[in-house]
């Protein structure tokens, strides 16, 4: 079944942008001016998820790349990774659970909770130039709030 998708950029609540760091990792850092063109453009898709009153299930792909953010166990710890997929089959309404994030929107701030690992969130560090990761704490040092901006093609 077709899915509703949009193209956007994400910035954390400290206004750090997300950029590629090697082929399979994202990092967060402050960008200005022309450097803003480095930021990753996501293709966010509305997918099937568990019933909830305040969470909207989405998948986060990298625009025009066959890469999706996914959540897997590595060394017994929930971990965020970029995973290659067959572009002929993605995005789809029924995404595998590791690709699904529950988007929680409060006062124009977005959180992305892993559907596979409840209470684990896409996170950035306070420090500059550090990897985007899956964090198990909210409201601590690490940043779990993001803002979204549409990208005009």
């Amino acid at each position: 079944a077709p899915v509703r998708s949009l193209n956007c950029t994400l910035r954390d609540s400290q206004q750090k942008s997300l950029v590629m760091s090697g082929p399979y990792e994202l990092k967060a850092l402050h960008l200005q001016g022309q450097d803003m063109e480095q930021q990753v453009v996501f293709s966010m898709s509305f997918v099937q998820g568990e019933e909830s009153n305040d969470k909207i299930p989405v998948a986060l792909g990298l625009k025009e790349k066959n890469l999706y953010l996914s959540c897997v166990l590595k060394d017994d710890k929930p971990t965020l990774q970029l995973e290659s997929v067959d572009p002929k089959n993605y995005p789809k309404k029924k995404m595998e659970k590791r690709f699904v994030f529950n988007k929680i929107e409060i006062n124009n701030k977005l959180e992305f909770e892993s559907a596979q690992f409840p209470n684990w969130y896409i996170s950035t560090s306070q420090a500059e130039n550090m990897p985007v990761f899956l964090g198990g704490t909210k409201g601590g040092q690490d940043i779990t709030d993001f803002t979204m901006q549409f990208v005009s093609s």
């Epitope: 079944a1 509703r4 949009l6 193209n7 909207i56 803002t147 979204m148 549409f150 005009s152 093609s153």
Partner: antibody, heavy 119, light 108 residues
Amino acid sequence: EVQLVESGGGLVQPGGSLRLSCTVSGFSLSSYAMSWVRQAPGKGLEWIGIIYDSASTYYASWAKGRFTISKDTSKNTLYLQMNSLRAEDTAVYFCARERQIFSGDMDGWGQGTTVTVSS
Amino acid sequence: EIVMTQSPSTLSASVGDRVIITCQASQSIDNWLSWYQQKPGKAPKLLIYRASTLASGVPSRFSGSGSGAEFTLTISSLQPDDFATYYCQNTGGGVSIAFGQGTKLTVL
């Protein structure tokens, strides 16, 4: 305060075209999706389509081809281009804001602009 | 496309009555359903989203329930301001968003 104001309605002949505008304030089109919904006289609500970024628009099956939604974020303005208009397109046209991205529901509405298709 | 069917199409009731409006989807939409109230010459107003969550500023006499393909809107004790037309809306089935045909609530 969230405000949406439609304009551009009026009388148009069958086969003609019309472009409606919806100017918004109190929020940004760069982070909210917008729909167009219409209501024929004495009839129910009919969803036309929705726009996220300028490349991501979705339409009701009946609206594909004749209706095009676009926006100018710098002007905080949403548009509905209507072509090959027919008598059955006579309606009040509303713009509406999606409450949250992909929520589908609409928490802010304009007052509507009336389109009459008649010779 | 998913079709939304409301019943009844018209409903007459009195102030203080308990009123129930139903909405059926042609296939399961989980809890992706909203309800709106519209008064003549006015824009619709969001009442309930995700089947049961009250929108901001909506009185608690309104409630929604249901999941899958069957949904209800209940007004526990009808007030004079509640006479209006009510619409359900599928918000999550595929790429299309569809309204029911409406239920007109009139004074008995």
